[in-house]
């Protein structure tokens, strides 16, 4: 057991690291590092993660199990997967809402909040690309509703008042005077 | 509370032998490794000797390998010391400690009163 | 064998000082480093492990920093019980090796 950086251990299995004066067997997923082995190739003395904590990886150092994040309800994040012992709390937008992204370059661990998803049936459109990831990607209008502007104009019920091109194409009527 | 004793000092001629005890109380001695630490008279600390919680490892500084042995009984939470052609610089008082508390394997944390051990014709 | 070297060997203070004591050893040892206090007639006491960490029960006023070769006990407004003799030692390879000690004494 020399006192260089990185010695090699000659332990049967692998998993084994020189841990001070020793060559340890580390601690699994789930668990901290109370003490070091003391002997050689022995097993170091491993605790569970207290509850609220996780460590996702086998480890020869961790004398301390990382906190659990909790979800920002100020952002309307919702716990998608609770924290377990060898997992942070999973954290997400529940049904009908979709993740919005706070940093330009957004990966898994960027911070986000929650917006509705829009509904294209209060918009009297087609639904297009349903809501999960992003915002619902809304079509056409839906039968009896035809497009002015920006919105769906529900088609008219009689003979009267007007009913532009787009309308009587959709809708079926021609404009009466 | 956690305790070590020593005892079996004494003074013994050249070529003699001794052999040292250490009594633990407090703790659950077989779940922990001990060590023997001397210092001679006036002088500073040297580490003598390690044995593992179940004896099957144990080392030695070079200045006694040879002719120290370290031993344990878990059942009598007592560790011991075998000491053997006895030379005047083996002359200190050789205390018996572990570490009960800390996660750093080869610190002491807890340490006997010592035992005076005197090497002279 | 891993030699650890402490300057100085002694050093006189006075109570309400700073005294900083330090230590080197003769290879990389990461932080496996502990200090100890040691009081005429008595056992060392045990201060700090794992070059940093306070042992329980220890005054805050003593810290410990360093990591590798370099090591450091700083003492922060010393008490009329803190004059005693220092020890370093290393914990990374056999034999377990001290330091030749730092006695603190009444200036």
């Known amino acids: 057991q020399g006192g260089t950086r990185s010695p090699r251990c000659d332990c049967a299995g692998d998993f084994h690291k020189k841990i001070g004066l020793f060559c340890c067997r580390g601690c699994p997923a789930g668990h901290y590092l109370k003490a070091p082995c003391t002997e050689p190739c022995g097993n170091s003395t491993c605790l569970v993660c207290p509850q609220d904590t996780f460590l996702a990886w086998e480890n020869h150092h961790n004398s301390e199990c990382a906190r659990c994040q909790a979800c920002d309800e100020q952002a309307s994040q919702v716990a998608l997967e609770n924290c377990s012992a060898v997992a942070d709390t999973r954290c997400g937008c529940k049904p009908g809402w979709f993740v919005e992204c706070q940093v330009s370059q957004c990966v898994s661990s960027s911070p986000f909040y929650c917006q509705p998803c829009l509904d294209c049936g209060a918009l009297h459109r087609h639904t297009r690309l349903l809501c999960s990831r992003r915002d619902t990607d809304c079509g056409t209008c839906l039968p009896g509703f035809y497009e002015h502007g920006d919105g769906c104009v529900s088609c008219p019920t009689s003979t009267l008042g007007s009913c532009p091109e787009r309308c009587a194409a959709v809708c079926g009527w021609r404009q009466m005077f | 509370e956690v305790q070590l004793v020593e005892s079996g000092g004494g003074l013994v001629k050249p070529g003699g032998s001794l052999r040292l005890s250490c009594a633990a109380s407090?703790?659950?001695?077989?779940?922990?490794?001990m060590s023997w630490i001397r210092q001679a008279p006036g002088k500073g600390l040297e580490w003598v000797s390690y044995?593992?919680?179940?004896?099957?490892?144990?080392n030695y500084a070079d200045s006694v390998k040879g002719r120290f042995t370290i031993s344990r009984d878990n059942a009598k939470n007592s560790l011991y010391l075998q000491m053997n052609s006895l030379r005047a610089e083996d002359t200190a008082v050789y205390y018996c400690?572990?570490?009960?508390?800390?996660?750093?394997?080869?610190?002491?944390?807890?340490w006997g009163q010592g035992t005076l051990v005197t090497v002279s014709s | 064998d891993i030699e650890m070297t402490q300057s100085p060997s002694s050093v006189s203070a006075s109570v309400g000082d700073t005294v900083t004591i330090t230590c080197r050893a003769s290879?990389?040892?990461?932080?496996?480093l502990a200090w100890y206090q040691q009081k005429p007639g008595q056992a060392p006491k045990f201060l700090i492990y794992?070059?940093?960490n306070l042992q329980s029960g220890v005054p805050s006023r003593f810290s410990g920093s360093g990591y590798g070769t370099d090591f450091t006990l700083t003492i922060s407004g010393l008490q009329p019980e803190d004059f005693a003799t220092y020890y370093c030692?290393?914990?990374?390879?056999?034999?377990?090796?001290f330091g030749g000690g730092t006695k603190v004494d009444i200036k």
């Open positions: 400690a572990s570490n009960v508390d800390t996660a750093m394997v080869g610190a002491f944390d807890i």
């Open positions: 290879q990389h040892i990461s932080n496996w």
């Open positions: 794992t070059a940093s």
């Open positions: 044995i593992s919680s179940s004896s099957s490892y144990t």
């Open positions: 030692q290393q914990a990374d390879s056999f034999p377990l090796t």
């Open positions: 407090g703790f659950t001695f077989s779940d922990y490794y």
